[in-house]
């Protein structure tokens, strides 16, 4: 009778992560008597996957009933496959011996490759806010996928971006891979409602890409424009001066009124109105008692927005002349609080 051969018919098997891998193995003879063991790898570092004779292998089930005397099918199923299971599996026949069984024949091996889905892309923006016209970087990361081939695209409000750089690691073969991409985005004043999207396509996703998003509202700072206006006289000795703070984002804003350089009142923006583009407007007013002043009064509206250096706008209130509506429609310059724009 011809000597027993161990046949592993599949040179390679490709399985999706989470699924069950079937590793086929048959023997050509019932003789010699002895168990089958499955190993990953060979040599001194090989890993025992299944032992027909003894042991507990919760992820492994046999395809046929190995207790039947005439059984020659030693195929196994390994459940809940992960990328870490990739490798070459050997079906090894042992000959019954005393005290120990002796290795008798090995199959040629089956390469198990694992297809694993990428994790949901995580998009992160810069640590600090930036103002319009500045270029900011966004990163996108996804992990744990296999095989290595993957496609990543960037979008801003549905428009595909072209200025980005992508790396897949590691460079060589691995059980699973990670992708890291950095995109550059130029901010505009209209970007409060904008979104940046990172889209990842992989063979395991069956044409339904994964997306990660970042809202530019968390990245952008739109500095305010200031306008100080003197309103008509309410009473003979009172003047109402307003400071219009327009088109700012985010809402965090503190306004200080100064009369001739001395702090008159400080308040925090609360009841703001929202513009269509997501920016905010706010107005503060100051009632000035003209009779309390002998000389002309210099009123300054000083605004500190989102922790940035203060910007200010000044208005000269003529005490000698009869107060009439006056002011400026010129936008305030972004000057430090120690410099004043006098109109």
């Amino acid at each position: 009778e011809e000597e027993l051969q161990v046949i592993q018919p599949d040179k390679s098997v490709l399985v999706a992560a989470g699924e069950t891998a079937t590793l086929r193995c048959t023997a050509t003879s019932l003789i010699p008597v002895g168990p089958i063991q499955w190993f990953r790898g060979a040599g001194p570092g090989r890993e025992l996957i299944y032992n027909q004779k003894e042991g507990h292998f919760p992820r492994v089930t046999t395809v046929s009933d190995l207790t039947k005397r005439n059984n020659m099918d030693f195929s196994i199923r390994i459940g809940n496959i992960t990328p870490a299971d990739a490798g070459t599996y050997y079906c090894v026949k042992f000959r019954k011996g005393s005290p120990d069984d002796v290795e008798f024949k090995s199959g040629a091996g089956t390469e198990l490759s694992v297809r694993a889905k990428p994790s949901a892309p995580v998009v992160s923006g810069p640590a600090a806010r930036a103002t319009p016209q500045h270029t900011v970087s966004f990163t996108c990361e996804s992990h744990g996928f296999s095989p290595r081939d993957i496609t990543l695209k960037w979008f801003k409000n549905g428009n595909e971006l072209s200025d980005f750089q992508t790396n897949v690691d590691p460079v060589g073969e691995s059980v699973s891979y990670s992708i890291h991409s950095t995109a550059k985005v130029v901010l505009t004043r209209e970007d409060v409602h904008s979104q940046v999207i990172c889209e990842v396509a992989h063979v395991t996703l069956q044409g339904d890409p994964l997306r990660g998003t970042a809202n530019l509202s968390e990245t952008i700072r739109v500095p305010p424009t200031l306008e100080v206006t003197q309103q008509p006289v309410r009473a003979e000795n009172q003047v109402n001066v307003t400071c219009q703070v327009r088109k700012f984002y985010p809402q965090r804003l503190q306004l200080t009124w100064l009369e001739n350089g001395n702090v008159s009142r400080t308040e925090t923006a609360s009841t703001v109105t929202e513009n269509k583009d997501g920016t905010y407007n706010w107005m503060s007013w100051l009632l000035v008692n003209v009779s309390a002043h002998r000389d002309d009064v210099k009123l300054t509206c000083q605004v500190e927005h989102d922790g940035q250096p203060a910007v200010s706008k000044s208005h000269d209130l003529k005490v000698s002349a009869h107060p009439k509506e006056q002011g400026s429609n010129t936008a305030a310059e972004n000057t430090g609080s120690n410099e004043r724009n006098i109109y």
Epitope: G41, A42, G43, G45
Partner: antibody, heavy 123, light 107 residues
Amino acid sequence: QIQLVQSGPELKKPGETVKISCKASGYTFTTYGMSWVKQAPGKGLKWMVWINTYSGVPTYADDFQGRFAFSLETSASTSYLQINNLRNEDTATYFCARDPHYYGTSPAWFAYWGQGTLVTVSA
Amino acid sequence: DIVMTQSQKFMSTTIGDRVIITCKASQIVGIAVAWYQQKPGQSPKLLIYSASNRFTGVPDRFTGSGSGTDFTLTISNMQSEDLADYFCQQYSTYPFTFGSGTKLEIK
């Protein structure tokens, strides 16, 4: 097809250093481990080291610890063997040989071999 | 270290002969044995692994057998291109060791 191409022959003096290379092609370098094997003229084969090309970690035979350094340049799919402070008994052909396993955790038999690099040490 | 002994340093053969090359391990190595063929000026070529598995592309006149400590490589129908050195190797335990080789010559 799978190829391991080694650098050319070297003639060195005792005490010098030699560095030879083995460039792999036809497969993904870091999927399979790499060994180095020594063969002195007219003699048998002696296994020196196995390198896990994915992690870069080597496993040495006792006789080849110390003066022998093994390294990888994965981006160039190349393995290197450096011998310091050369001795006459280092005169041999050095072969690189590839593992059979896909993600093997250890070496076993040597499925593919480089053509060999003859290192001659002579005063 | 495990010593792999190839007792025949040289073997004289005739074309068409059945040639049996033996290798004995100093301790049990299971079936963790490979056989290589090496021709002058060339690198070794893998013939057999796991004691009896023929490597891809190896002619079926080459057969490996044995387990435990005693192993054989059989060439069933000796050809002129088979004139070479033959080495066994164990990979059961570090360090991996080779036999000293058996050289086939024509009578």
